[in-house]
């Protein structure tokens, strides 16, 4: 039988006076050495039978005293079996046994749970000694139970090489309810049900559970731990907690907000951070996710010319980096640029829209018609084109650069001239008789030098030939011109 | 299958006493509590409290404090009105009802008509 | 305590027609719960926190809201439909019923 000890239940000690008990209560023992604190027990018990001979491990020693009379079966006497206290108490509970003196060097280990408690423990162990037997009482107390401290204790002698086990001794240390699981803050989708859960311990058991959701009790009535609340949905942000109830109280738990996803605020702080003539680099600080992660950006770009068409151009990226260069893009030409991102509710609306300007470029294109033609009494070549379209100048016009080659018996010399945005002419000296002049024209911007124009070759002459006509970019698809003149 | 059972209608003088019987089934009594509703001739539903299954304690609302009593016999799994000192404003239809999470009512009684007259 | 306004007291509709009942709060609310009585017989369970319809509720009933206010659709009336139809708040106890909306089928 297991005897069982509760709080408050009243003293009834196992031996009268100073003889080994189950518990210290008010007697002195003698050869009893001081406790390490001086608390006063939390239980006392009624032990069943007293002195009862151990019933399971026992030791049956071979000596027999002068009269030959062979010695009682040793063994632990019967203590209390269960005892329950309340968290942060002190508990002290001992094994007694009484041994004959023929025996030396007896001594006593605690086990717990299957282990040796070494150590820092409080355990001490009492002789009474008598002219045949020595009574020993081992005593082990907690100062401040502690959940830890639950399980089932035995002690445990040695003699002539058996093992002499007492009965256990369980602890159960009571308190409030522990959370073993908490609810978890979430990010939920509107008006969609999702689950939290809830789970407490003792001992004391049953532990029940009541949610809370915005101050208001979910459950009027207890549940059993554990506990799932199916929440029905949300529309607004709402904080649950749960509430652990057990004989000894209530614990409760954190609080989490649950929140509503939402399509993300627009971005802000929208900047240029490089601007050249053909695209433009933009990163933006992203607004609120709307507790949903960023999925990707939107980058609209419109010509922020009024007689533009107003189309805008939209280019998609990941929502990392925060920056794009946006490509493609007229030189030297006002945009307006807006961003927006999405999550997996929506879009953002557009951040504010920001005013960014292309660069001049190099123009993309060379000059049109470029005709060449010797002009025999000035000894020049005289060059004649046409300026690149105004759309393909991707800047201000500041000049050309014209550049003629000039080959003869397997010499070649090129020169380059700058002229003026003024005009669409040029004249140059002749540089080399009997040779070839091969003339090509670049526009020129503050963006640099544009491609060249296809080349256009003219045959001088040695000095006293007469007949010349001018040469003349090809149409396309024509080999080389080469007029010989 | 889940219901709760009313007893039969009650013709009453005022001054007299009702105690009027919900019984429940298809479930574990203890977990939910029985709430009481009234409904007066031609009116709508007025909450009138509820009774914890679990420990036995009774919640009245404000309209409902004195002569109104809930009680229980958790081994027949039956909830109890009782109406102290009958008067005419009395005179209504009481239904029993089940609450789930949230106060929603999920099971009705049919109800138990009372009838006041003297 | 929250006080439920129905609107509107009686509903008048011809079968296959659209309606929509109202129900406010004088303060924010969680959740609305609705019943339907027909005469004579209990409240039936019928839409549970704000939209999750009961079973056996025919799915041509629909309700949603958030905050103070509260609706009830039904999308093609029903001769079977005529009948009041109570709201009940979630949010702050006592949890109160709404006066009613009384359907009627012309």
């Known amino acids: 039988a297991i005897t069982e000890a509760r709080e408050e239940a009243k003293p009834y000690p196992l031996f009268p006076g100073p003889f080994p008990g189950s518990l210290q209560t008010d007697h002195t023992p003698l050869l009893s050495l001081p406790h390490a604190s001086g608390y006063q027990p939390a239980l006392m018990f009624s032990p069943t039978q007293p002195g009862r001979p151990h019933t399971g491990n026992v030791a049956i020693p071979q000596v027999t005293s002068v009269e030959s009379k062979p010695l009682p079966p040793l063994a632990f006497k019967h203590t209390v079996g269960h005892i329950i206290l309340s968290e942060h108490k002190g508990v002290k509970f001992n094994c007694s046994i009484s041994v004959p003196n023929i025996y030396q060097d007896t001594t006593i280990s605690w086990w717990k749970d299957g282990k040796e408690l070494l150590g820092a423990h409080h355990a001490i162990t009492q002789f009474y000694p008598d002219d045949e037997v020595t009574a020993i009482i081992a005593s082990f107390s907690i100062t401040s139970v502690q959940r830890s401290d639950n399980g089932s204790y035995i002690c445990k002698m040695k003699i002539n090489n058996e093992e002499i086990v007492s009965d256990p001794i369980y602890i159960e240390v009571q308190g409030l309810p522990h959370f073993t699981k908490q609810p978890e803050s979430m990010n939920v989708t509107r008006n969609t049900a999702f689950n939290l859960t809830c789970q407490a311990v003792g001992p004391p058991e049953p532990v029940n559970i009541f949610w809370v959701q915005n101050s208001s009790r979910v459950n009027e009535q207890p549940e059993k731990s554990p506990s799932v609340l199916t929440v029905p949905g949300l529309t607004e942000m709402a904080v649950f907690s749960c509430e652990a109830h057990n004989d000894k109280g209530l614990t409760v738990s954190k609080g989490v907000q649950i929140n509503i996803k939402a399509i993300p605020s627009p971005p802000t702080e929208v900047s240029i951070r490089n601007s050249t003539a053909h695209s433009i680099l933009i990163s933006w600080v992203p607004g609120f996710d709307g507790y949903s992660p960023f999925r990707n950006c939107s980058i609209q770009v419109k010509e922020a010319d009024p007689l533009s068409n107003g189309s805008v151009m939209i280019f998609n990226t990941s929502a990392l980096p925060h920056l794009y260069q946006i490509k493609q893009l007229q030189a030297l030409a006002n945009y307006s640029i807006g961003v927006s991102c999405m999550n997996e509710i929506g879009w953002s609306a557009v951040s504010p829209w920001i005013l960014a300007s292309t660069t001049e470029g190099a123009p993309s294109v060379a000059p049109l018609n470029v005709t060449v033609f010797l002009n025999e009494s000035s000894d020049n070549v005289d060059i004649r084109w046409m300026k690149p379209p105004t759309k393909q100048q991707d800047g201000e016009l500041v000049g050309y650069r014209i550049s003629h080659v000039w080959q003869s018996a397997g010499i070649s010399k090129e020169l380059l001239e700058e002229v003026g945005q003024n005009g669409s002419r040029a004249r140059i000296s002749v540089q080399v008789h009997n040779a070839t002049c091969t003339v090509r024209i670049a526009a020129v911007t503050r963006g640099g030098v544009g491609p060249f124009s296809d080349p256009v070759k003219i045959f001088i002459p040695a000095h006293g030939w007469v007949d010349y006509a001018p040469s003349s970019t090809p149409a396309p698809g024509n080999a080389d011109p080469v007029l010989i003149i | 299958q889940i219901q709760l059972v009313q007893s039969g209608p009650e013709l009453k003088q005022p001054g007299e006493t009702v105690k009027i019987s919900c019984k429940a089934s298809g479930y574990t009594f203890t977990d939910y509590g029985v709430n009481w509703v009234k409904q007066a001739p031609g009116k709508g539903l007025k909450w009138m409290g509820w009774?914890?299954?679990?420990?036995?304690?009774?919640t009245y609302a404000g309209d409902f404090k004195g002569r109104f009593a809930f009680s229980l016999e958790s081994s027949a799994s039956t909830a109890f009105l009782q109406i102290n000192n009958l008067k005419n404003e009395d005179m209504a239809t009481y239904f029993c009802?089940?609450?789930?999470?949230?106060?929603?009512?999920?099971?009705w009684g049919a109800g138990t008509s009372v009838t006041v007259s003297s | 305590q929250i006080v439920l306004s129905q609107s509107p007291a009686i509903l008048s509709a011809s079968p296959g027609e659209r309606v929509t009942m109202t129900c406010r709060a004088n303060s924010s609310v969680s959740y609305m719960h609705w019943y339907q009585q027909k005469p004579g017989s209990s409240p039936k369970p019928w839409i549970y926190?704000?939209?999750n319809l009961a079973s056996g509720v025919p799915a041509r009933f629909s309700a949603s809201g958030s905050g103070t206010s509260y609706s009830l659709t039904v999308s093609r009336v029903e001769a079977e439909d005529a009948a009041t139809y109570y709201c009940?708040?979630?949010?702050?106890?006592?949890?109160?019923f709404g006066s009613g909306t009384k359907l009627e089928i012309k």
């Open positions: 009774i914890n299954t679990y420990s036995g304690e009774p």
């Open positions: 009940q708040q979630w949010g702050s106890n006592p949890f109160t």
């Open positions: 009802a089940r609450r789930v999470r949230y106060w929603y009512f999920d099971v």
């Open positions: 926190a704000t939209s």
